[in-house]
């Protein structure tokens, strides 16, 4: 609460996160023209990336384009991309939606459709829907440990959210354990009124707000965090503004002296830890 | 404008960026002693990296050191690094400018020059100039979509820069479309009074400032962002303070059971999105 | 100092860091059943990662699990993980401490111990102590150049920590050179009253605070940074809250058409650069 006689100072904060959990992923795998069900295990090194403290990312879904090579090929026949003659294809043109640079030729994509030939990583990425349900939907049961160190330099005061008395096997609960800093990802979504299973398909951004309202006067000292959760991406966003949260990354390798890559379009939840608040002292 | 009767609160912000564009790169490629012109395509997975929301990086130039192996070799004969006898080479010495640890021997680098032998990733990186013009100079035409969600917790008010009425095929323009949040990289530089083609060679840091001056009183409500741009790195910086913006990363692989790496010195533009402002309410 | 007649404004900041240094690492390497001493060189591309400006990471220690493959194997026999019959193993169970999903079978780990079989990256990671002393303990002698650009938009004032008069071969010292922005990592720890050699084993988080207390009135203008250092992770933290600083990442590759990975558990120092302060003007 506002104490007008106090000198207020904004919080200086540092965050460290640690995600735990394993996901079993079942998906169709095609090898040598034969499609069969493949099972694989994803651990933290597979689904998360070494990011800064105030953000962490958990991959919940993906689409792979394997064995791409830099060459010429027909572009993917998305809406409005088909052609019937070379006139429709403009040499040197880069359509922002396309994945390559047009050669000027209209070539067969398959037995019924023709598209403009492009210089690109081939075969070009198919614009297919993200798998539903999400491949790593079980990430709902992952947990994240959040360590937050705060400082009010003007008041020469430092503290952290984890106290020596805390129990490392706790799980945050708004009522039963509001000071525990180990959070189940599904619980974060539930608290924010969101459906993890749904968001996991396209990805999204979730805010974990840590509010420090600190009274640093010795006679009524109080300085503990309050956690709250809210979704940061716009779930009603128009297709043209890229709803959800995804990014592409590549694994490069050489095969028979040919430079190749596997392109991964990773969908997931980016968790932003937003620390704010003030320290007041007479 | 300052309304002294209002309670002001700083903005809490989350940012999500999405870069689009393809670059065609033409460079000399040497294979089996033969040098020829090579063309390659770079898409987002090749020139950008999965970074936090409030920063994104676009590679505009690079220098590659291919096929490096951990062994002994002469160090690169940069200014002041040549030797004529072993006396000039100190076993165990690590020159901060060098790329390895000296063995104490002075050995031939080529038919005219001798340098200290080092234990390093060999052959050591040549200290050659960044290519001019920049290899991905066409990144000037890339676009970035910036999504910004803001929150004034004390006023329990949340909004974002993208409104449902906005058109996903717009491009930001200071006069004609100042609320569009899709920016052409070249335009950002032009607005900041900088030359993209020039900066792309050595790299640099560009600030995209998003200023929210929000009046949250119902009778005169206003809360929309204002975008401005300024260069953050010092273009007049002394050589010793590492002008521009670059970093090195490596791709590791095994060949005939020997651990090798390709070292990439990536030059580019780091864009920092700096969100600030206040929300005022009676 | 507080000048009550001034209009105060918080700092808007952008940071760029550049780490320099080479480490020689000596460790036991096992090949074809033979263990011998291996020497390797680590340069910036090996021990640091392209991170955002306000944080950088230096790897000081690591544990490798080489040649992992997705298959079935006995889990690591950590405390409480051994079994004597299948009853102790629950099909489909994922122990947060384990690295895989149990099949329900109790199988031999070695000639004396049995553990639950898991579907995982095999062989599973051994829970061994981080090497002591730290493998890259010589990182104490690495240096980091910190460039900080600040802005007070309300006062239309911009400056940076590096001035044209500065010498690029300086090293920060609290007394002799408090404005030099090149810091020896060991000195940062010494200033913070911490032992680099000790922290390097398990990793940690170190804060570099840059305080700008700017008087922008022309008649008594002052705007230079003050650097201070403090450890941000809790060195007395209970084991259950994951002391130190580490993360796992993987290098994936194919061998005889089998997808494999090398898992690296990287321990190191994350340096957080915390910029704060105000600009005051009449």
């Amino acid at each position: 609460s506002d104490k007008l006689y106090q000198r207020k100072e904004p919080v200086i904060s540092s965050v460290h996160t640690k995600v735990k959990g394993i996901a079993e992923v079942t998906e169709n795998v095609t090898e040598g023209g034969v499609t069969k069900l493949g099972h694989s295990i994803f651990d933290t090194a597979d689904y998360t990336f070494p990011l800064q403290g105030n953000s962490f990312f958990v991959m919940t879904n993906y689409v792979k384009s394997e064995g791409q090579v830099q060459t010429l090929c027909p572009e993917y026949p998305r809406r409005g991309a088909q052609c019937s003659s070379d006139r429709r294809c403009k040499k040197g043109w880069m359509d922002p939606q396309s994945k390559g640079i047009q050669t000027g030729r209209c070539v067969p994509y398959d037995k019924t459709r023709k598209t403009c030939e492009v210089s690109a990583w081939c075969p070009t990425e198919e614009e297919k829907e993200a798998p539903r349900p999400a491949l790593l939907r079980s990430a709902e049961n992952f947990t994240v440990l959040i360590k937050n160190n705060i400082h009010f330099p003007g008041h020469n005061y430092t503290t952290r959210n984890i106290l020596p008395t805390m129990n490392g096997s706790c799980t945050f609960h708004k009522t039963w354990d509001p000071q525990c800093s180990i959070f189940r990802l599904g619980d974060i979504f539930q608290e924010a009124g969101e459906n993890f299973t749904e968001v996991a398909v396209q990805g999204g951004i979730m805010g974990i707000e840590i509010y420090w309202d600190c009274n640093l006067d010795s006679w009524s000292h109080h300085c503990r965090p309050r956690y709250s959760f809210r979704r940061l991406d716009d779930k009603n966003m128009d297709e043209s503004f890229v709803p959800g949260y995804n990014f592409r990354y590549a694994k490069y390798y050489k095969e028979n002296n040919v430079e190749k890559r596997t392109l991964i379009k990773a969908f997931g939840i980016r968790f932003d830890i937003l620390v704010f608040g003030t320290g007041g002292k007479f | 404008s300052d309304k002294l009767y209002q309670r002001k609160e700083p903005v809490i912000s989350s940012v999500h960026t999405k870069v689009k564009g393809i670059a065609e790169v033409t460079e000399n490629v040497t294979e089996g002693g033969v040098t020829k012109l090579g063309h390659s395509i770079f898409d987002t997975a090749d020139y950008t990296f999965p970074l936090q929301g409030n920063s994104f990086f676009v590679m505009t130039n690079y220098v590659k050191s291919e096929g490096q192996v951990q062994t002994l070799c002469p160090e690169y004969p940069r200014r002041g690094a040549q030797c004529s006898s072993d006396r000039r080479c100190k076993k165990g010495w690590m020159d901060p400018q060098s790329k390895g640890i000296q063995t104490g021997r002075c050995v031939p680098y080529d038919k005219t020059r001798k340098t200290c032998e080092v234990s390093a990733w060999c052959p050591t990186e040549e200290e050659k100039e960044a290519p001019r013009p920049a290899l991905l100079r066409s990144a000037e035409n890339f676009t970035v979509l910036i999504k910004n969600n803001i929150h004034f917790p004390g006023h329990n008010y949340t909004t974002r820069n993208i409104l449902p009425t906005m058109n996903g095929s717009c491009t930001f323009h200071k006069t004609w479309d100042p609320q569009c949040s899709i920016f052409r990289l070249g335009d950002i530089f032009q607005e900041a009074g900088e030359n993209f083609t020039e900066v792309a060679v050595q790299g640099g840091i560009m600030g995209i400032e998003i200023y929210w001056d929000c009046n949250l009183d119902s009778w005169s409500h206003h809360c929309r962002p204002r975008y401005s741009f300024r260069r953050l790195d010092d273009k007049n910086m002394d050589e010793s303070f590492v002008p521009g913006y670059n970093f090195r990363y490596a791709k590791y692989y095994k060949e005939n059971n020997v651990e090798k790496r390709t070292l990439i010195k990536a030059f580019g533009i780091r864009f920092d999105i700096l969100v600030f402002g206040t929300g005022g309410k009676f | 100092s507080d000048k009550l007649y001034q209009r105060k404004e918080p700092v808007i900041s952008s940071v760029h860091t550049k780490v320099k240094g080479i480490a020689e690492v000596t460790e036991n390497v096992t090949e074809g059943g033979v263990t011998k001493l291996g020497h390797s060189i680590f340069d910036t591309a090996d021990y640091t990662f392209p991170l955002q400006g306000n944080s950088f990471f230096v790897m000081t220690n690591y544990v490798k699990s080489e040649g992992q493959v997705q298959t079935l194997c006995p889990e690591y026999p950590r405390r409480g993980a051994q079994c004597s019959s299948d009853r102790r193993c629950k099909k489909g169970w994922m122990d947060p401490q384990s690295k895989g999903i149990q099949t329900g079978r109790c199988v031999p780990y070695d000639k004396t111990r049995k553990t639950c079989e898991v579907s995982a990256w095999c062989p599973t990671e051994e829970e061994k102590e981080a090497p002591r002393p730290a493998l890259l303990r010589s990182a104490e002698n690495f240096t980091v150049l910190i460039k900080n650009n600040i802005h007070f938009p309300g006062h239309n004032y911009t400056t940076r920590n590096i001035l044209p008069t500065m010498n690029g071969s300086c090293t920060f010292h609290k007394t002799w050179d408090p404005q030099c922005s090149i810091f020896r990592l060991g000195d940062i720890f010494q200033e913070a009253g911490e032992n680099f050699t000790e922290v390097a084993v398990q990793g940690g988080i170190m804060g570099i605070e840059i305080y700008w207390d700017c008087n922008l009135d022309s008649w008594s203008h002052h705007c230079r940074p003050r650097y201070s250092f403090r450890r941000l992770d809790d060195k007395n933290m209970d084991e259950s809250f994951v002391p130190g600083y580490n993360f796992r990442y993987a290098k994936y590759y194919k061998e005889n058409n089998v997808e494999k990975r090398t898992l690296i558990k990287a321990f190191g120092i994350r340096f957080d650069i915390l910029v704060f302060g105000t600009g005051g003007k009449f």
């Epitope: 023209g33 064995g67 090579v69 060459t71 010429l72 090929c73 027909p74 030729r105 070539v107 067969p108 994509y109 398959d110 037995k111 030939e117 081939c122 075969p123 040919v258 | - | -």
Partner: nanobody
Framework: EVQLVESGGGLVQAGGSLRLSCAAS?????MGWFRQAPGKEREFVAG????????RYADSVKGRFTISRDNAKNTVSLQMSGLKPEDTAIYYC???????????WGQGTQVTVSS
């Protein structure tokens, strides 16, 4: 699924020539040839994009083999000259989405080069 029929294989002496042909049941962007020698893995020989652009050859056949195709007829040919005993293999026609990527293979035709 694309049907592919190869022809033109046979026995030839070292240094001799042979022409392989292949007809596809439908048009496709790229057509190419692979081969498999006894006890070895199938390997790429030559490939052609639409209208013969681009073409790609394995290092071992460069300068000796020439690939050509007729888009109108959905056919591809491989003219082999300067044949060596190590060229002995079953040769397969293939179609795909680029000169590096093939999805469908024919039944194969035997080529034997005697010394």
């Amino acid at each position: 699924e694309v049907q592919l029929v190869e022809s033109g294989g046979g026995l030839v002496q070292a240094g001799g020539s042979l022409r392989l042909s292949c007809a596809a049941s439908e048009r496709t962007y790229s057509m190419g040839w692979f081969r498999q020698a006894p006890g070895k893995e199938r390997e790429f020989v030559a490939g052609s994009g639409w209208d013969g652009i681009p073409t790609r050859y394995a290092d071992s056949v460069k300068g000796r083999f020439t690939i050509s195709r007729d888009n109108a007829k959905n056919t591809v040919s491989l003219q082999m000259s300067g044949l060596k005993p190590e060229d002995t293999a079953i040769y397969y026609c293939a179609t795909g989405t680029s000169v590096y990527h093939y999805q469908y293979w024919g039944q194969g035709t035997q080529v034997t080069v005697s010394s």
